[in-house]
Interface confidence: medium
């Protein structure tokens, strides 16, 4: 990505996931009646134009914020508190990649307001789940659908990232 | 208690440059959002730029975009705002204002304001 | 960007009475997330602006329940049950939904 991001970066990405599904407790056919559409942005992750600094900050800011979902006193109740610490190991992990990374594309001068868009647009699309728990007052099914909802968001924003790296990967070898 | 310590106003000619500073003090400031507003001498607030805890997010409105930098010491509790290539419509009250950031819900609302620092450009 | 439209002052008011502020935008601020994101700022004479209600129809910490808030996503009125002397000031609107954040002008608080 042409900064000092490891090359495991896509690795943790796809362990987050991984984590993700072993965390679920409940059959999501048990909570059909709480599905919810949060609107996920997907114009963020779908544009072929991809700029380095827009990958890096939706990246960081989606991690930031499951961190932040996963990191309370009712997510603790929720989940299997093995399974939650190597989440938050690992999410911490990715953050700090991302922050040396993100300083070091607006140092190269890639704008920095390209960067503060997508955290806001985040930033409503997760107060949105946070408002939906609480109104289902953090039911299992309401985390299950919470679970599922930060997977399929997660995935979408893994991909862009794999995109992005086969984009350079392109541009090196011709 | 939280407070906002602001300074750095001055009178400065069309075209000079200036640097705002506002000390934190009472809370984490690493874990804030900041922004600054200023407020021009008809009473109206504009907003002037943002900056996330980290300092990795930035954003301008086009009216200082280029000419203003908003930056952060984490270490030293401090916020600034470099200004520069100043128009006399820059002539304003400036504030730092903190983010209410609290809880996980990541608002943008400002709980916490600087007592302003004045800005006069005038030649 | 978005316009916040606000009436320079309001209907001046009597201490003890109720007293409504009204503010309108140029864009829905209902997000699709179920949140409206319309604040509500108080400048007393002399002092920085402070925070009086945010997402709308929240209270923020501190602020007596005399002060309340509603709105259709457009059109918002932030409403004073019973005016107090240290009620008076000038009360601005503004929106956080998008970048550029904005604010409305302002409305001065009368008292007759």
């Known amino acids: 990505l042409g900064c000092d991001l490891p090359q495991n970066h896509g690795l943790l990405s796809r362990n987050t996931l991984v984590l993700l599904h072993q965390m679920r407790r409940i059959s999501p056919f048990l909570c059909l009646k709480d599905r919810r559409d949060f609107r996920f942005p997907q114009e963020m992750v779908k544009g072929s134009q991809l700029q380095k600094a827009h990958v890096m900050s939706v990246l960081h800011e989606m991690l930031q914020q499951i961190f932040s979902l996963f990191h309370t006193e009712r997510s603790s109740a929720a989940w299997n508190m093995t399974l939650l610490d190597q989440l938050h190991t690992g999410l911490h992990q990715q953050l700090q990649h991302l922050e040396t990374c993100l300083l070091q594309v607006v140092g190269e001068g890639e704008s920095a307001g390209a960067i503060s868009s997508p955290a806001l647009t985040l930033r409503r699309y997760f107060q949105g789940i946070r408002v939906y728990l609480k109104e289902k007052k953090y039911s299992d099914c309401a985390w299950e659908v919470v679970r599922m909802e930060i997977m399929k968001s997660l995935f979408l924003s893994t991909n862009m990232q794999e995109r992005l790296r086969s984009k350079d990967r392109d541009l090196g070898s011709s | 208690e939280v407070q906002l310590q602001q300074s750095g106003g001055d009178l400065v000619k069309p075209g000079g440059s200036l640097k705002l500073s506002c000390a934190a003090s009472?809370?984490?400031?690493?874990?804030?959002?900041m922004s600054w507003v200023r407020q021009t001498p008809d009473k109206r607030l504009d907003w002037v730029s943002i900056?996330?805890?980290?300092?990795?997010?930035?954003y301008y409105p086009d009216s200082v975009k280029g000419r203003f930098t908003i930056s952060r010491d984490n270490a030293k509790n401090t916020l600034y705002l470099q200004m520069s290539s100043l128009k006399s419509e820059d002539t304003a009250m400036y504030y730092c204002?903190?983010?209410?950031?609290?809880?996980?819900?990541?608002?943008?609302?400002?709980?916490?304001w600087g007592q302003g620092t004045s800005v006069t450009v005038s030649s | 960007d978005i316009v916040m439209t606000q009436a320079a002052f309001s209907n001046p008011v009597t201490l003890g009475t109720s007293a409504s502020i009204s503010c309108r935008s140029s864009?829905?601020?209902?997000?699709?997330?179920?949140?409206?994101?319309l604040y509500w700022y108080l400048q007393k004479p002399g002092q920085s602006p402070q925070l009086l209600i945010y997402q709308m129809s929240n209270l923020a910490s501190g602020v007596p329940d005399r002060f309340s808030s509603s709105g259709s996503g457009i059109d918002f009125t932030l409403r004073i049950s019973r005016v107090e002397a240290e009620d008076v000031g000038a009360y601005y609107c503004a929106q956080n939904l998008e970048l550029p954040f904005t604010f409305g002008s302002g409305t001065k608080l009368e008292i007759k």
């Open positions: 009472g809370f984490t400031f690493s874990s804030y959002g």
């Open positions: 900056i996330t805890s980290g300092g990795s997010y930035t």
């Open positions: 204002a903190r983010h209410a950031e609290g809880g996980g819900n990541y608002d943008y609302a400002m709980d916490y």
């Open positions: 864009k829905s601020l209902l997000h699709s997330n179920g949140i409206t994101y």
